[in-house]
C-alpha cells in the first residue's frame, strides 16, 4: 500500500447561511492523526502516537494550512446558487500518495450534501463529474467560482499537491507511520439461543498493519462466503485497527467451529467457547458501521460524513 | 508442495497399542487440521477424528472415543495417533490427511499398515 | 449417523463411454459438504470433487458433480483406462464424517 496523507474538511450553511467554522480531521496511512478544535480553533494530535512524535510545530503549521483552507471552502459554499432551507455541507477531501516506486498522487473531491460532485486530480489539474444533472450543476457553479477567483490556478493546484507531499514526507520520517507489527488481540464471543441457533463472533483488535485474514471455520474448512458476515477494517484510534467476523451455528456443534485469523505471516485458530454459561453471558452485539470522531456535530446535525 | 509421510507398517499383538506418526511438509503445519481415516483390508473408508494442530483441539468419531488418541508435535510439524488395547478389528491402513481449507481431505499420506496378529 | 449409499457397486465400462455413479444420502446435506474422491488399487485416495462440483488441482475436466439434497452424482465425460479405480463419496455436513460404500470402476 502506498503512504497516503489525507484531510477531511466541511464546512455547514443553515438557511443559506454559512456556519462560521469549519470541521476537519487528518488521516495519515489511514490512521487518524490530527482533528480540528473547533472551540480552540487549533489542529490537535489524535491518538497518543500523534502526540509523542510530531511536536507543537506541526500542529501551528497545519491549524494555519487548514485554517486557510477552511475559509476557501466556506467561501466556495457561499457561491452554490441552489441552497434551500435548512442544513446542508460542503465536503473537500484532500488526499496525496507516495508509492513504492517513489510515483506520486494527488487529488481532491467535493461532496454536497454527501453527494460527490466533483474530483480533481491535483498533478494533472483534470477535472472528473459524474452523469448526475446536479452534479453537473454543483461543479460548474464551483468552476466558475474559482474561475474569477485569481487563487485556484494551475500553480496553486501543483503548490497544494507538493506541500501535501512535503508534509507526508516530513510526517513518515518522523516515524508517526512507522512500519511496525502489531499482532492482533482475537476474542470469540457467542450471543443468546434463538430456534437452536447461535450467531458467533470473532473479533480482531489492535492490530497493525491494516491487512488482515479473518474467517471462519468449519472442521478447518472455511465457510462460504455468503454464510459469514463481515465488518469493516477500521481504525481504533490508537493507530491500530479492529474489525469481526461473524456467522450462525448450531448449538451444540461449537467444538466443530474456529475463528481463523492471518496477519502479517502470523496465523491462529480460535475455539468458540463451549457450555451454557459462556453463550449466555455474552451480550447480543448489533454490528454497525460506526463512523469515527468528529460525532458531536455529526450526531447533533445528522450530517453524512464521508471516509 | 505439500507432504505427508507416515511411519512404516506395524506388525502387533493382541492388548498391545501402536503410534502412528505422519509428519507434515511443504506448509505451516499449523495453519491446517490432520485428520485421520481407517480403510480395512477390501472395505471403505471411516473417519476417525481430527485435530487442530495451533492448539491441540480433537473432534473424534464416538466409535472411536477410547480407541483412538490424536496428538501434535509442533516443533517437529508431526502429528501422531495413538491406538491401544488393539484387536484384529483394528487391522487396517490408516491414513492421515490434511486440507487447504476449502475441502476436508486435500493431502493425504501414503498409509501405515497396522497389522494385529498374534 | 448419516449414511451414503453408492450405486453401481462394481461396473464396467468401455473406452470413451459416459459413466455415471450416484450417492444417496440417508438425509439431506448442503451441496457444500459432499465431497468425491479416487483411489487407485495399492494407492492412497486422491481428491476428485469437493463441494459437489469443483475439479480439485490437476483432475481432468472429463469428471464432473452434481446434485441436491439427498442425491448426488460423479460423471465421467468419456471412459480412459487410467481411470480405473474405486471412487467415494464423502459427506461432511454432521459427524461423525462418513463415506460411501465406494463404487469399483473397471475397464472392459
Known amino acids: 500500500e502506498p503512504h497516503s496523507l489525507r484531510y477531511n474538511l466541511m464546512v455547514l450553511s443553515q438557511d443559506g447561511s454559512v456556519q462560521s467554522g469549519f470541521l476537519a480531521e487528518g488521516h495519515l496511512d489511514g490512521q487518524p492523526f490530527l482533528r480540528y478544535d473547533r472551540q480552540k480553533r487549533r489542529a490537535k494530535p489524535q491518538g497518543q502516537w500523534a502526540e509523542d512524535v510530531l511536536g507543537a510545530k506541526t500542529w501551528d503549521t497545519e491549524t494555519e494550512d487548514l485554517t486557510e483552507n477552511g475559509q476557501d471552502l466556506r467561501r466556495t459554499l457561499t457561491h452554490i446558487k441552489d441552497q434551500k432551507g435548512g442544513l446542508h455541507s460542503l465536503q473537500e477531501i484532500r488526499v496525496c500518495e507516495i508509492h513504492e516506486d517513489s510515483s506520486t498522487r494527488g487529488s481532491r473531491h467535493f461532496y454536497y450534501d454527501g453527494e460527490l460532485f466533483l474530483s480533481q486530480n491535483l498533478e494533472t489539474q483534470e477535472s472528473t463529474v459524474p452523469q448526475s444533472s446536479r452534479a453537473q450543476t454543483l461543479a460548474m457553479n464551483v468552476t466558475n467560482f474559482w474561475k474569477e477567483d485569481a487563487m485556484k490556478t494551475k500553480t496553486h493546484y501543483r503548490a497544494m499537491q507538493a506541500d501535501c507531499l512535503q508534509k507526508l514526507q516530513r510526517y513518515l520520517k518522523s516515524g508517526v507511520a512507522i512500519r511496525r507489527t502489531v499482532p492482533p488481540m482475537v476474542n470469540v464471543t457467542c450471543s443468546e439461543v434463538s430456534e437452536g441457533n447461535i450467531t458467533v463472533t470473532c473479533r480482531a483488535s489492535s492490530f497493525y498493519p491494516r491487512n488482515i485474514t479473518l474467517t471462519w471455520r468449519q472442521d478447518g474448512v472455511s465457510l462460504s462466503h455468503n454464510t459469514q458476515q463481515w465488518g469493516d477494517v477500521l481504525p481504533d484510534g490508537n493507530g491500530t485497527y479492529q474489525t469481526w467476523v461473524a456467522t450462525r451455528i448450531r448449538q451444540g456443534e461449537e467444538q466443530r467451529f474456529t475463528c481463523y485469523m492471518e496477519h502479517s505471516g502470523n496465523h491462529g485458530t480460535h475455539p468458540v467457547p463451549s457450555g451454557k454459561a459462556l453463550v449466555l453471558q455474552s451480550q447480543r452485539t448489533d454490528h454497525h458501521h460506526h463512523h469515527h470522531g468528529l460525532n458531536d456535530i455529526f450526531e447533533a446535525q445528522k450530517i453524512e460524513w464521508h471516509e | 508442495q505439500v507432504q505427508l509421510k507416515q511411519s512404516g507398517p506395524e506388525l502387533v499383538k493382541p492388548g498391545a497399542s501402536v503410534k502412528v506418526s505422519c509428519k507434515a511438509s511443504?506448509?505451516?503445519?499449523?495453519?491446517?487440521?490432520i485428520y485421520w481415516v481407517k480403510q480395512s483390508h477390501g472395505k471403505s473408508l471411516e473417519w476417525i477424528g481430527y485435530?487442530?494442530?495451533?492448539?491441540?483441539?480433537?473432534v473424534q468419531n464416538q466409535k472411536f472415543k477410547g480407541k483412538a488418541t490424536l496428538t501434535v508435535d509442533k516443533s517437529s510439524s508431526t502429528a501422531y495417533m495413538h491406538l491401544n488395547s488393539l484387536t484384529s478389528e483394528d487391522s487396517a491402513v490408516y491414513y492421515c490427511?490434511?486440507?487447504?481449507?476449502?475441502?476436508?481431505?486435500?493431502?493425504w499420506g501414503q498409509g501405515t499398515l497396522v497389522t494385529v496378529s498374534s | 449417523d448419516i449414511v451414503l449409499t453408492q450405486s453401481p457397486t462394481t461396473m464396467a465400462a468401455s473406452p470413451g463411454e459416459k459413466i455415471t455413479i450416484t450417492c444417496s444420502a440417508s438425509s439431506s446435506i448442503s451441496s457444500n459438504y459432499l465431497h468425491w474422491y479416487q483411489q487407485k488399487p495399492g494407492f492412497s485416495p486422491k481428491l476428485l470433487i469437493y463441494?459437489?462440483?469443483n475439479l480439485a488441482s490437476g483432475v481432468p475436466a472429463r469428471f464432473s458433480g452434481s446434485g441436491s439434497g439427498t442425491s448426488y452424482s460423479l460423471t465421467i465425460g468419456t471412459m480412459e483406462a487410467e481411470d480405473v479405480a474405486t471412487y467415494y463419496c464423502q459427506q461432511g455436513s454432521s459427524i461423525p464424517f462418513t463415506f460411501g460404500s465406494g463404487t469399483k470402476l473397471e475397464i472392459k
Open positions: 511443504g506448509y505451516a503445519f499449523t495453519k491446517y487440521n
Open positions: 485435530i487442530d494442530p495451533y492448539n491441540g483441539g480433537t
Open positions: 463441494r459437489t462440483s
Open positions: 490427511a490434511t486440507t487447504d481449507g476449502y475441502s476436508l481431505f486435500t493431502y
